[in-house]
Interface confidence: medium
């Protein structure tokens, strides 16, 4: 698409325009106080040393002040996520000051050049904050810097350079290239603000990781493992955008961090919770759904301040669109015996039945392998609130749906042609809700029938002891 001129004109225009056409030299970083949710309102430009615009535009010295910092831009214009974020902040915090940091001329360059400009932009923001601190009633503790992509590292520099400590920095998928593994003073880090929270939505362990993989805040949240975001697959994107390309997938996943944050502002009645875990695989296994000792937190704007001695990595699953909230369940299935399993892992599905709704048929992802005479833990999640769980249907898929499994079955048959029926024995399923922290045990409907085999199902109902509550904190309760 063509590169329209921004508030300061295109960089090329500046370089080639004769001096006479310049009525004044425009700064490369401008601070636009958004005075309305409407993007057509021009807002007010603030500049260090000029108090009049603060008065003219009703800058509220005692209110929260948000600085939104965009990242690298290929188009040279503000993208729509910015409009959505401004609007959401105005909706949620009606008295707050919302300032858009416009560094388009410095960001609309080669990526490497834009990276080199982040320090300068950070300095400009710090200077603005230092000047505002000279005003009565303005408190740095009320300042919240929100930086997307490269803008997250700009926020880090600003927090580092300012005299005093900024209240909060939120990094929305901080940029990865040229920052991964960098020294803490050359990227966003926990010492840049009193509270630094980060959302990672485009991290890749292979190929180019657009977003930074390493934790860089007090809490680092990795929705859907921080890599493949639902609704951002090539098929999804091709379906919704006429000119869908791999670039659209990148944009979708990278920008998802912004939309998760917007969601937390506008859908505060549907908060998403993340759970502390050492890595994505353990989370996928369902091991990490605890809220004890500050191990869970709301994501986005509603995140509770946690200043851990070391980075806290947190994980959650989400829906493909707003509201992003899902309901997480840990399922502990004790397999006390199995027969003739061969090489192939079974494919299990569960359907959860609750007082409010029933789930869809949900796959049980086997991260490693099914262990016998052991408790196997799984993570399942539903898009709807099921209410109190009443019963569970466990199904073992019959005919294999993958060529790999078919091949393994065929090999199994060749080595043991008279392979008798495969069978598992399961007496009970223990379920824990991540959102309510409630635990419940389900027993087989018929205590005599505990076996399940391919193509068969097993029903479980709440055991007689009913709900078993452990003394654990629910994420819906305020966390310290």
């Amino acid at each position: 698409s063509p590169v329209p001129f921004g508030p300061e004109g295109r960089l090329e225009d500046k370089l080639h325009k004769p001096k006479a056409t310049q009525t004044e030299v425009k700064p490369s970083v401008r601070f636009n106080l958004r005075t309305s949710k409407d993007p057509e309102h021009e807002g007010c430009y603030l500049s260090v040393g000029h108090s009049q615009p603060l008065e003219d535009c009703s800058f509220n010295m005692t209110a929260k002040t948000f600085f939104i910092i965009h990242g690298w831009t290929m188009s040279g214009i503000f993208e729509n996520w910015l409009h959505k974020l401004v609007s959401a902040l105005h909706t949620r915090e009606k008295d707050a000051n919302v300032v858009v940091v416009d560094w388009l001329p410095l960001a609309h360059q080669l990526y490497t050049d834009a990276v080199n400009n982040t320090r300068v932009v950070g300095h400009s923001i710090a200077r603005m904050l230092d000047w505002l601190q000279e005003k009565d009633d303005f408190s740095l503790g009320n300042v919240h810097l929100i930086g997307y992509s490269l803008g997250a590292h700009v926020a880090g520099y600003a927090g580092n350079f300012v005299k005093g400590t900024v209240g909060r920095i939120t990094g929305l998928d901080p940029a990865g290239p040229m920052f991964e593994g960098a020294d803490i003073h050359k990227r966003l880090s926990p010492d840049d603000a009193d509270f630094v929270d980060v959302l990672h939505t485009y991290t890749r362990s292979f190929g180019l990781s657009i977003g930074i993989q390493m934790p860089v805040g007090h809490i680092d949240i990795y929705p859907n493992g921080g890599d493949f975001q639902p609704g951002c697959g090539l098929n999804d994107v091709l379906g919704s955008i006429a000119y869908g390309t791999i670039t659209e997938v990148v944009k979708c996943e990278h920008e998802r961090a912004v939309h998760l944050f917007v969601d937390s502002l506008v859908n505060q009645d549907k908060p998403s919770f993340a759970f502390q875990c050492t890595d994505s695989n353990r989370f996928k296994k369902g091991i990490c759904l605890s809220c004890r000792k500050n191990r869970c937190n709301s994501i986005g704007y509603n995140a509770k301040k946690m200043r851990n001695k070391r980075n806290s990595k947190m994980y959650l699953k989400t829906r493909a669109g707003m509201p992003f909230r899902v309901y997480h369940y840990q399922m502990k299935i004790h397999v006390f015996s199995y027969k003739n399993m061969g090489e192939i892992e079974p494919t299990f599905y569960v359907t959860l039945y609750g007082t409010n709704a029933d789930s869809q048929t949900l796959p049980l992802e086997i991260v490693e392998r099914i262990e016998q005479n052991a408790t196997n833990t799984f993570l399942v999640y539903t898009e709807e609130d099921l209410g109190d769980l009443l019963k569970i249907q466990l199904t073992w898929e019959g005919a294999s749906q993958s060529w790999y499994n078919l091949w393994k079955e065929f090999r199994s048959y060749l080595s043991q042609p008279r392979n008798p029926g495969r069978e598992l024995n399961i007496r009970r399923i223990r379920v824990k809700s991540g959102e309510t922290q409630r635990k419940l045990t389900f027993c087989t409907e018929d205590p005599e029938n505990t076996s399940i085999s391919p193509g068969r199902e097993l029903w479980f109902r709440k055991c007689r002891d009913g709900w078993r509550m452990k003394n654990e904190t629910s994420p819906t309760v305020e966390l310290p």
Partner: antibody, heavy 119, light 106 residues
Framework: QVQLVQSGAEVKKPGASVKVSCKAS????????MHWVRQAPGQGLEWMGS????????SYNEKFKDRVTSTRDTSISTAYMELSRLRSDDTVVYYC????????????WGQGTTVTVSS | EIVLTQSPGTLSLSPGERATLSCRAS?????MYWYQQKPGQAPRLLIY???NLAPGIPDRFSGSGSGTDFTLTISRLEPEDFAVYYC?????????FGGGTKVEIK
């Protein structure tokens, strides 16, 4: 290059409705809001309203709020403005104009669509 | 709504002369925008954010002012500059235009 091409002239009876289209090309349609401005013969310009094609949000001049509707079809990069309960003083030229979010000006305009309201 | 009053309504000048067009707002606005319109054509942006020249606009055009009083100046009129000029504000909805100043050949 950027182009905004509007639908052709219309003649309508009082009380009827008219729907003017504005097809955008040469840029990413969803990245700019589209505005509608009208001009009576020999008169000044009057802002009617806007639509953000990205998510369909609209903003209207109170004067037209109960009669104007802005819509868009992102699949064909087209914005529409429908004006209902037409009166003779709606006999004007209607322009669509592109506006970059937060950059504060109409940088490209359509060629205009003349609507004549006559019984 | 903010009312923009342009003066004079008509300005009769010769090529090479200086033209000064005024736009007064009924209440304070942050910035002013200026457009040029020729018969049968759509308006064309000249000045944005009070004093910034739009790309492709010659440097004989300049804008100034603040608060409620704004000015568009054409330092030396060229034959193609004879047209109607409108000021416009984006400070408050509805976004209003002035009534226009017609610059005609004397």
């Amino acid at each position: 290059q950027v182009q905004l091409v509007q639908s052709g002239a219309e003649v309508k009876k009082p009380g009827a409705s008219v729907k003017v289209s504005c097809k955008a090309s040469g840029y990413t349609f969803t990245e700019y809001t589209m505005h509608w401005v009208r001009q009576a013969p020999g008169q000044g310009l009057e802002w009617m309203g806007s639509i953000n094609p990205y998510y369909g949000g609209t903003s209207y001049n109170e004067k037209f709020k109960d009669r104007v509707t802005s819509t868009r079809d992102t699949s064909i990069s087209t914005a529409y403005m429908e004006l209902s309960r037409l009166r003779s003083d709606d006999t004007v030229v209607y322009y669509c104009a592109r506006y970059g979010n937060y950059v504060g000006y109409f940088d490209y305009w359509g060629q205009g669509t003349t609507v004549t309201v006559s019984s | 709504e903010i009312v923009l009053t342009q003066s004079p309504g008509t300005l009769s000048l010769s090529p090479g002369e200086r033209a000064t067009l005024s736009c007064r707002a009924s209440s304070s606005v942050h910035y002013m925008y200026w457009y040029q319109q020729k018969p049968g054509q759509a308006p064309r942006l000249l000045i944005y954010y009070t004093s910034n020249l739009a790309p492709g606009i010659p440097d004989r055009f300049s804008g100034s002012g603040s608060g409620t009083d704004f000015t568009l100046t054409i330092s030396r009129l060229e034959p193609e500059d004879f047209a109607v000029y409108y000021c416009q504000q984006f400070t408050s909805s509805p976004y209003t235009f002035g009534g226009g100043t017609k610059v005609e050949i004397k």
